[in-house]
Amino acid sequence: ACDTATCVTHRLAGLLSRSGGVVKNNFVPTNVGSKAF
């Protein structure tokens, strides 16, 4: 899977959207690596 910073950002946005935004406060692109997915 793509692990560039931009891919991580878009994947996280999708995850936040699907979860209704209910995730930990520090779950942001600069805090998570691609392995977080």
Partner: antibody
Framework: EVQLQQSGPELVKPGASVKISCKAS????????MNWVKQSHGKSLEWIGD????????HYNQKFKGKATLTVDKSSSTAYMELRSLTSEDSAVYYC????????????WGQGTTLTVSS | DIVMTQSQKFMSTSVGDRVSVTCKAS??????VAWYRQKPGQSPKALIY???YRYSGVPDRFTGSGSGTDFTLTISNVQSEDLADYIC?????????FGGGTKLEIK
């Protein structure tokens, strides 16, 4: 409102260095990567690199290694790009850009900084 | 580095028409392509990410499609304000790379 405000135009001599700034507002600066992009006159775009404002980590385009240095100042929510050993080939418009998710999911770009290298 | 080729440097269209701008990647980049519009004298503005998803505020006249190596940006019901350069970008691999742009001219 998310904004990326870049520093003003620069006219510098060959061989000199310059530091361009990009001040972020309207979102949490440390949450999102900051990208830097070069646009030479009449040409398309070249990605220089990105910086993680949370920890200062960087990815560089090999072409710009040794030419560009990307840093951040978290206290002022400002990203910087220093360009060194300038030549006429470095004359261009330089943009900062960041994809945010909160408060809005969008890919924001600064207004651009024009760099002219001339003796 | 991945080369993004926009073979048509210029395209001419009329208000109300539909036009398709194409972009070809030198290797498989999955769906990880963005499209930007750059009006003369302005910064690029993001339109599409992940090949086919519009950013908020982008009119639904703009549609992206494709995956792998072949990508298309379609503009339906072209407006006079669509006079601009349209540029693709891949972000599947570092370094990110951009196409050379397609300049849309309005007849």
């Amino acid at each position: 409102e998310v904004q990326l405000q870049q520093s003003g135009p620069e006219l510098v001599k060959p061989g000199a260095s310059v530091k361009i700034s990009c001040k972020a507002s309207g979102y949490t600066f440390t949450d999102y990567y900051m990208n830097w992009v070069k646009q030479s006159h009449g040409k398309s775009l070249e990605w220089i690199g990105d910086v993680n404002p949370n920890n200062g980590g960087t990815h560089y385009n090999q072409k710009f290694k040794g030419k560009a240095t990307l840093t951040v100042d978290k206290s002022s929510s400002t990203a910087y790009m220093e360009l060194r050993s300038l030549t006429s080939e470095d004359s261009a418009v330089y943009y900062c850009a960041s994809i945010t998710i909160v408060p809005v999911y969008f890919d924001f770009w600064g207004q651009g900084t024009t760099l002219t290298v001339s003796s | 580095d991945i080369v993004m080729t926009q073979s048509q440097k210029f395209m001419s269209t009329s208000v109300g028409d539909r036009v398709s701008v194409t972009c070809k990647a030198s290797q498989n980049v999955g769906p990880n392509v963005a499209w930007y519009r750059q009006k003369p004298g302005q910064s690029p503005k993001a339109l599409i990410y992940s090949a086919s998803y519009r950013y908020s505020g982008v009119p639904d006249r703009f549609t992206g499609s494709g995956s792998g190596t072949d990508f298309t940006l379609t503009i339906s019901n072209v407006q006079s304000e669509d006079l601009a350069d349209y540029i693709c970008q891949q972000y599947n691999y570092y370094p990110y790379t951009f196409g050379g742009g397609t300049k849309l001219e309005i007849k």
